[in-house]
């Protein structure tokens, strides 16, 4: 959480970002927020990328002014008009690229003064990992396949009965480039696995970290997915 | 002098439909959301939904939704909110004011009487 | 939705002494709160919005505090046009929601 506070000239007001990660191809939320201030015509919106010329986007008198807007953002922003009212001053990003990431500020002018705030942009591809009982296998075998993931995470597993047992020896992975030559298919497969034990596949990188759990017995087997985004620092 | 005029009271039949008029000054209107609150005899406020015609976009309590509509007229600088299938608990004084987030003007209040 | 409580429902105080009256939050808004007047016959006045700043033409006596749940709005040196009813209003997020209102009373 980063939050900053206006200089010099009228009241400094304050503004609050949360440093946040981007699904490369998919859309994505900037958070910022502000004090609201119920003379809507006098809000300015500004959102700055660091070393980038343009502007990544502008609101101001109630809709977008994207004159100045850098041509790598092109129609790909927005804020939500009806949460300005309240503060809301977040930025959608659509089809989010590699090099989005970067250091953005958000700068905010209200009738009561100014302020802005920095935000930490990430970008990379993660997505929930399944884990299913691999049938084909000569041994009681599990698979772990997540579709996309950039850059190349870490695939550890672990196990419920076994805790703190290293599965390393026991298992294998590999990274499947995808069609689009940036993300990978990751596959990871447990060899040798017990029943009436719950078995966890977890993928992290220095973006997101995932968990899919399942759990075999003789009459059914349960599964369960986790995602959580790294370094959602508020600022 | 900022002022919301509202239109004037109303008996009306269950069932039936209401319409509550708010002129305001032509800065108001261009500057401002302009926002309904009604108050139930004896009871607390409730914030009924609101038009920014700057943002041009309009919310509504979930409470109201379906049964609510709010509309502004730049031309004239007058806002309405019209409220379908009216029941006795609809009985209220209806106001309009200037804002959100917050409300730091207040038209007279429009008393609104759904009684067969 | 967040809903808004205040305490007491009435409060009796004589005149010259402070009144404090509270509201409660069931979430954090911040400081995106504000308090109105109402006397009976009235539209609601604005008091106080941001939590603690005074809307335009409030006396100083006339105070606002507290962030995230908790709040208070306190009158010190009550006067007879002081007597009303208070009620809080968040407006952290859609919708927004007033407090019941503390009805404040000549003692």
């Known amino acids: 959480l980063i939050i900053g506070f206006g200089i010099s000239g009228r009241h400094s007001i304050t503004v609050t970002t949360v440093a946040s990660a981007g699904n490369i191809g998919e859309d994505g939320i900037l958070s910022c927020t502000f004090e609201p201030d119920i003379k809507l015509s006098d809000i300015v919106i500004q959102w700055l990328k660091e070393g980038v010329i343009g502007l990544v986007h502008e609101f101001k008198e109630g809709k977008d002014e994207l004159s100045e807007q850098d041509e790598m953002f092109r129609g790909r922003t927005a804020v939500f008009a009806d949460q300005v009212i309240v503060g809301n001053a977040s930025l959608r990003l659509k089809n989010v690229q590699l090099t989005d990431a970067g250091t953005y500020k958000c700068y905010i002018i209200t009738s009561k003064g100014k302020g802005n705030a920095n935000l930490e942009y990430k970008t990379g591809a993660f997505s929930m990992p399944e884990v299913n009982v691999d049938y084909n296998a000569s041994s009681e075998t599990l698979r772990c396949e997540a579709p996309r993931w950039f850059p190349q995470p870490t695939v550890v597993w672990a196990s419920q009965v076994d805790q703190g047992a290293n599965f390393s020896e026991v298992s294998n992975t590999s990274f499947e480039l995808n069609s689009e030559n940036v993300t990978m298919k990751v596959v990871s497969v447990l060899y040798n696995v017990t029943i009436n034990n719950t078995y966890s596949c977890m993928i992290e990188n220095d973006i997101a970290k995932a968990t899919g759990d399942i759990k075999v017995t003789e009459s059914e087997i349960k599964r369960r997915s986790h995602l959580q985004l790294l370094n959602s620092k508020a600022s | 002098q900022v002022q919301l005029v509202q239109s004037g009271a109303e008996v009306k039949k269950p069932g039936s439909s209401m319409r509550v008029s708010c002129k305001a000054s032509?800065?108001?209107?261009?500057?401002?959301?302009i926002s309904w609150v009604r108050q139930a005899p004896g009871q607390g406020l409730e914030w009924m939904g609101g038009?920014?015609?700057?943002?041009?976009?309009?919310n509504y309590a979930q409470k109201f939704q379906g049964r609510v509509t709010i509309t502004a007229d730049k031309s004239t600088s007058t806002a309405y909110m019209e409220l379908s299938s009216l029941r006795s608990e609809d009985t209220a004084v209806y106001y309009c004011?200037?804002?959100?987030?917050?409300?730091?003007?207040w038209g007279q209040g429009t008393l609104v009487t759904v009684s067969s | 939705e967040i809903v808004m409580t205040q305490s007491p429902a009435s409060l009796s105080v004589s005149p010259g002494e402070r009144a404090t009256l509270s509201c409660r939050a069931s979430?954090?808004?911040?400081?995106?709160l504000a308090w109105y007047q109402q006397k009976p016959g009235q539209a609601p006045r604005l008091l106080i919005y941001?939590?603690?700043t005074r809307a335009t033409g409030i006396p100083a006596r006339v105070s606002g505090g507290g962030s995230g749940t908790e709040f208070t709005l306190t009158i010190s040196s009550l006067q007879s046009e002081d007597f009303a009813v208070y009620c809080c209003?968040?407006?952290?997020?859609?919708?927004?929601?007033f407090g019941p209102g503390t009805k404040l009373e000549i003692k």
């Open positions: 209003q968040q407006y952290k997020n859609w919708p927004f929601t």
């Open positions: 979430q954090s808004v911040s400081s995106n």
């Open positions: 941001g939590a603690s």
């Open positions: 004011a200037r804002g959100g987030p917050y409300f730091d003007y």
């Open positions: 032509e800065d108001t209107f261009s500057s401002y959301a």
């Open positions: 038009t920014a015609p700057i943002f041009g976009t309009t």
